[in-house]
Interface confidence: medium
């Protein structure tokens, strides 16, 4: 004969545990039903009656099978620097994540407690490591032969163009400028040959090194519209 199925509430066999989605009630000393996600225990079980469950009220939730007397409160509304990626329902908490251009500086169990804007690299510097959901942008100085002329949280250092004839050499914050040569003989009527970059790399001009402290490679740092209080020059 098959084993008899016990209906809740029931007294468990000595040494055994309650089944899945049941809990042991210490007062009734019985195995009783848990409430499903989105519900909570309105009345606890007795020796003769099972748990009475009720739906969570607005702005509260339970995510797991449970026997809690009250549902959990959903988190506060997402702040202006966040977006709601999961709404508050009877079965799940609200989840706020940082909006584009921001990262999570202080996380919590789910979502983010504090968002911060991704930093931008100023001209002369490019992005060494892009920002992620949980980490800020890391900048690096543009190496010789490369430049960045933007203030950006995404732009990397790009190679200088190389010219047939250089008008203005490139530096860390500016691309090389090529000289416009006189038009050569046209292949077809009205056609004009404009100077083209011949490759994507260029020689990197160095600023005048300071005596005694100059490293082997220097960078020209831009002074920008509002220069810092301290001098901004590469060695």
């Amino acid at each position: 004969l098959p084993a008899q199925v016990a209906f809740t509430p029931y007294a468990p066999e000595p040494g055994s545990t309650c089944r899945l989605r049941e809990y042991y009630d210490q007062t009734a000393q019985m195995c009783c039903s848990k409430c499903s996600p989105g519900q909570h225990a309105k009345v606890f079980c007795t020796k003769t009656s099972d748990t009475v469950c009720d739906s969570c009220e607005d702005s509260t939730y339970t995510q797991l099978w449970n026997w809690v007397p009250e549902c959990l409160s959903c988190g506060s509304r997402c702040s202006s620097d966040q977006v709601e990626t999961q709404a508050c329902t009877r079965e799940q908490n609200r989840i706020c994540t940082c909006r584009p251009g921001w990262y999570c500086a202080l996380s919590k169990q789910e979502g983010c407690r504090l968002c911060a804007p991704l930093r931008k690299c100023r001209p002369g510097f490019g992005v060494a490591r892009p920002g992620t959901e949980t980490s800020d942008v890391v900048c690096k100085p543009c190496a010789p032969g490369t430049f960045s002329n933007t203030t950006s949280s995404t732009d990397i250092c790009r190679p200088h163009q190389i010219c047939n004839v250089v008008a203005i050499p490139g530096n860390a914050s500016m691309d090389a400028v090529c000289t416009s040569t006189s038009p050569t003989r046209s292949m077809a009527p009205g056609a004009v040959h404009l100077p083209q970059p011949v490759s994507t790399r260029s020689q990197h001009t160095q600023p005048t090194p300071e005596p005694s402290t100059a490293p082997s490679t220097s960078f020209l740092l831009p002074m920008g519209p509002s220069p810092p209080a301290e001098g901004s020059t590469g060695d």
């Epitope: 500086a105 911060a116 930093r119 931008k120 690299c121 100023r122 002369g124 510097f125 060494a128 980490s135 800020d136 890391v138 900048c139 690096k140 100085p141 190496a143 203030t151 402290t213 490293p215 082997s216 490679t217 220097s218 960078f219 810092p228 301290e230 901004s232 590469g234 060695d235």
Partner: nanobody, 126 residues
Framework: QVQLVESGGGSVQAGGSLRLSCAAS????????MGWFRQAPGKEREGVAA????????YYADSVKGRFTISQDKAKNTLYLVMNNLKPDDTGVYYC???????????????????WGQGTQVTVSS
């Protein structure tokens, strides 16, 4: 987060020298730029010197060029600032900072999430 501890401050006569050290621990891989800032009484904090690990790029404020030298011992995760020919104007609290602000290439200095040391006092008397 990177933890930074400065040492080497003290009192010195004008024209004297000091060497500041900054020991870094924690997620030091994040900090490809390390720098020194100082704050004199009643003044704003100012960037003094900075360097990028793995490059020859270095930065010095105009007021310290030719007198201060920034260097790093990568094996010991330690940043140094050798200060020669000190002047009374160099007096202040010197802070070590990781991957921070304008002198490290960022567009502003107002980032509260970067690492700062607790500072070491430097006093230069005439």
């Amino acid at each position: 987060q990177v933890q930074l501890v400065e040492s080497g401050g003290g009192s010195v006569q004008a024209g004297g020298s000091l060497r500041l050290s900054c020991a870094a621990s924690g997620h030091t891989y994040r900090s490809n730029c390390m720098g020194w800032f100082r704050q004199a009484p009643g003044k704003e904090r100012e960037g003094v010197a900075a360097m990028y690990t793995g490059t020859d790029w270095k930065y010095y404020a105009d007021s310290v060029k030719g007198r201060f030298t920034i260097s790093q011992d990568k094996a010991k995760n330690t940043l140094y600032l050798v200060m020669n020919n000190l002047k009374p104007d160099d007096t202040g609290v010197y802070y070590c900072a990781a991957d921070f602000g304008f002198i490290c290439g960022y567009d502003s200095d107002d980032d509260p999430y970067d690492a700062w040391g607790q500072g070491t006092q430097v006093t230069v008397s005439s």
